[in-house]
């Protein structure tokens, strides 16, 4: 790494993955292991986020970049940048203070993560149930009771619900 | 009746961030999804992502997740999808669509949000 | 991530023809299939949802069919205006995905 020559911050020409050392007369140095820096000119290199635990690493840590982690099979993640791992349901459930709990009636969770909601009220849109809820999954809408010819039945019983559903994201 | 209307064209240099808007009428904002899908030049659709307005709740595709940021502001009925550290393979049509009555499909569209990224 | 294979990927027929498309998901999405409509000028339009549902106000010549991992969408007698890209969705499993497209074009 070249000694900078810039008559303003000699600092300012240390490319993404070194630092300016002040103890080697601000000499462009590389960051050391396990640590990093995103952007020229820094004094100083970020010292790598270690995924442990519950965490594992979804991307390493580079000169230049941070390390990424997400959540261990049976978690998900929350938070900016996935600073918090929290555990899975099944679909048509819940996470409580007291663990997984299964959704009240007229509500539904067809993901892993997440609450239970309300089945959707197709009324709001002049449309009738198509198919009825369940725990794992909503209703499907259809068409106004008036669309429907007549001796058509509107309600179709839900489809079983199947494992995995909707993947945690 | 139902309307969703997009944000202009956005021409950006590679590194920077485009923030489209997709603002909702003719319905409750706040009781349907609202989706983000990409159309690259030539190709096919693409689902990045969906949020439920009344509590914010967001689902993302993997491929997106470092990409996109979805949120809504529920006073204007408006949703928005930022991308950012935008690349030439973020050149695309994005549209944002409502679910039909439960988020299983999509039945309103918007027009379409034409963003070229270009040096 | 659900694939969803589409065939053909492009079409050509003559007016009054019938026109069918099928969409193959990589595993079991019950009934969650939804097929729309893209016209030349960008436009995206629900034609069915739920696999055989008409959208209201969508003509009667569409329609569709099946369940599992085999689907097909039919226009019983081809119009002018049906020249457009076909794009089939699962709806069954984040993240929603959508077949290629079929292309079709008028003889």
């Known amino acids: 790494f070249e000694r900078t020559r810039s008559l303003q911050d000699p600092c300012s020409n240390c490319p993404a993955g070194t630092f300016c050392d002040n103890n080697r007369n601000q000499i462009c140095s590389p960051c050391p292991p396990n640590s990093f820096s995103s952007a020229g000119g820094q004094r100083t290199c970020d010292i790598c986020r270690q995924c442990k635990g519950v965490f594992r690493t979804r991307k390493e840590c580079s000169s230049t970049s941070n390390a990424e982690c997400d959540c261990t099979p049976g978690f998900h993640c929350l938070g900016a940048g996935c600073s918090m791992c929290e555990q899975d349901c099944k679909q048509g459930q819940e996470l409580t203070k007291k663990g997984c709990k299964d959704c009240c009636f007229g509500t539904f969770n067809d993901q892993k993560r997440g609450i239970c909601r309300p089945w959707t009220n197709c009324s709001l849109d002049g449309k009738s149930v198509l198919v009825n809820g369940t725990k794992e999954r909503d209703v499907v809408c259809g068409p106004s009771p008036a669309d429907l010819s007549p001796g058509a039945s509107s309600v179709t019983p839900p489809a079983p619900a199947r494992e995995p559903g909707h993947s945690p994201q | 009746q139902v309307q969703l209307v997009q944000s202009g064209a956005e021409v950006k240099k590679p590194g920077a961030s485009v923030k489209v808007s997709c603002k909702a009428s003719?319905?409750?904002?706040?009781?349907?999804?609202i989706n983000w899908v990409k159309q690259a030049p030539g190709q096919g659709l693409e689902w990045a992502g969906n949020?439920?307005?009344?509590?914010?709740?967001?689902n993302y595709n993997q491929k997106f997740k470092d990409k996109a940021t979805i949120t809504a502001d529920k006073s204007t009925s408006t949703a928005y999808m930022e991308l950012s550290s935008l690349r030439s393979e973020d050149t695309a049509v994005y549209y944002c669509?409502?679910?039909?009555?439960?988020?299983?499909?999509?039945?309103?569209w918007g027009q379409g949000t034409t963003v070229t990224v270009s040096s | 991530d659900i694939q969803m294979t589409q065939s053909p990927s492009s079409l050509s027929a003559s007016v009054g023809d019938r026109v069918t498309i099928t969409c193959r998901p990589s595993?079991?999405?019950?009934?969650?299939l939804n097929w729309y409509q893209q016209k030349p000028d960008k436009t995206v339009k629900l034609l069915i949802y739920?696999?055989?549902r008409l959208r209201s106000g969508v003509p009667s010549r569409f329609s569709g069919s099946g369940s599992g991992t085999d689907f097909t969408f039919t226009i019983s007698s081809l119009q002018p205006e049906d020249i457009a890209t076909y794009f089939c969705?699962?709806?069954?499993?984040?993240?929603?995905?959508f077949g290629q497209g079929t292309k079709l074009e008028i003889k």
């Open positions: 669509t409502r679910d039909y009555g439960s988020a299983y499909s999509m039945s309103t």
């Open positions: 003719g319905y409750t904002f706040t009781s349907y999804w």
């Open positions: 949020i439920y307005p009344s509590d914010s709740y967001t």
């Open positions: 595993q079991d999405i019950s009934n969650y």
């Open positions: 739920y696999t055989s």
């Open positions: 969705q699962q709806g069954d499993t984040l993240p929603y995905t």
